[in-house]
Amino acid sequence: PRSIDVKYIGVKSAYVSYDVQKRTIYLNITNTLNITNNNYYSVEVENITAQVQFAKTVIGKARLNNITHIGPLDMKQIDYTVPTVIAEEMSYMYDFCTLISIKVHNIVLMMQVTVTTTYFGHSEQISQERYQYVDCGRNTTYQLGQSEYLNVLQPQQ
């Protein structure tokens, strides 16, 4: 069998809302993946599991099941959304994200995704992780790749 390639493209959109009473930020983050099947037979994308971390804390998880099949030598682009919550011991972020005298409220999030594919009863898992900028101060739609955070290390928050 040839490889199945998973490429994390980036954040497609981030939609933000706030709970004033709880000083909580809700971010719905939609990500884009390209999955390429380099084989001469179809493969099933059985599930995608994703999680988002902020400052080493998991702030959101998602799982998509029975997603699609990819034909021989074909590629499919898949969007998936992770609902995230920034609250409690990170409620200081609410002050940053709702401070409107600054225009851009970029925070660095670590996106982790695992794709499980199956073919002929065989299962394969491919994982990727990437740091991405997301604006927590407003709803944002990104050009693919625009939100990428290029440094290897996550900055101090």
Epitope: Y18, V20, Y92, D95, L99, I100
Partner: antibody, heavy 119, light 112 residues
């Protein structure tokens, strides 16, 4: 717990430069979204914002006084400084510093320091 | 600048009854993010101001739930459900929507 304390000369002569210090504890000015602001209150009157400084060193001044004000910080010493140039009797007031934040406004205030401009 | 307007004095109120204090802004304080950037402070006699309410409706830490706030984008009301002697002072509304941040002139709570 969060505390702030203002200090100043008490009395200053007209046309001099006034220096005020705000010493704080219980929070870090390295935290995103945090800042310290200066507010003054002439005796028997209302509150007036003077200046603010944020964690990222952004500074904002009340426009009518901007040419006379300078705000700065020493994060390692947990201190904020405000200088007011060319003071006159209209600057006589109680000066407060307060911890500010985007979401919560001025959540913590110092006890204030009273300034009298007199020759 | 956004002008915050308040009456200088409240209607005289009896201890244990409710009181309302009004504030009007010259421009809507409702931001496109859904948050209204209106704040209430109380300055008790001889003391520093203290934060009561942030972003129109969020009670500050340690503030009793006798205090509540609401309003539209430009007209706001602070309500005290059962006035106590310790509530006496000057109530200031303020806005953080636009620079410069501004305070209202303050409303003095009067007891009967």
């Amino acid at each position: 717990q969060v505390t702030l304390k203002e200090s100043g000369p008490g009395i200053v002569q007209p046309s001099q430069t006034l220096s005020l210090t705000c010493s704080f504890s219980g929070f870090s000015l390295n935290t995103l979204g945090r800042g310290v602001g200066w507010i003054r209150q002439p005796s028997g009157k209302g509150l007036e914002w003077l200046a603010k400084i944020w964690w990222n060193d952004d500074k904002f001044y009340y426009p009518a006084l901007k040419s006379r004000l300078t705000i700065s910080k020493d994060t390692s010493k947990n201190q904020i400084f405000l200088k007011i140039a060319n003071v006159d009797t209209a600057d006589s007031a109680t000066y407060y510093c307060a911890r500010i934040a985007g979401g919560t406004g001025a959540a913590y205030w110092g006890q204030g320091t009273t300034l009298t401009v007199s020759s | 600048d956004i002008v915050m307007t308040q009456a200088a004095f409240s209607n005289p109120v009896t201890l244990g009854t409710s009181a309302s204090i009004s504030c009007r802004s010259s421009k809507s304080l409702l931001h496109s993010n859904g948050i209204t950037y209106l704040y209430w402070y109380l300055q008790k006699p001889g003391q520093s101001p203290q934060l009561l309410i942030s972003q129109m409706s969020s009670l500050a830490s340690g503030v009793p739930d006798r205090f509540s706030s609401g309003g539209s984008g430009t007209d706001f009301t602070l309500r005290i459900s059962r006035v106590e002697a310790e509530d006496v002072g000057v109530f200031y509304c303020a806005q953080n929507l636009e620079l410069p941040w501004t305070f209202g002139g303050g409303t003095k709570l009067e007891l009967k």
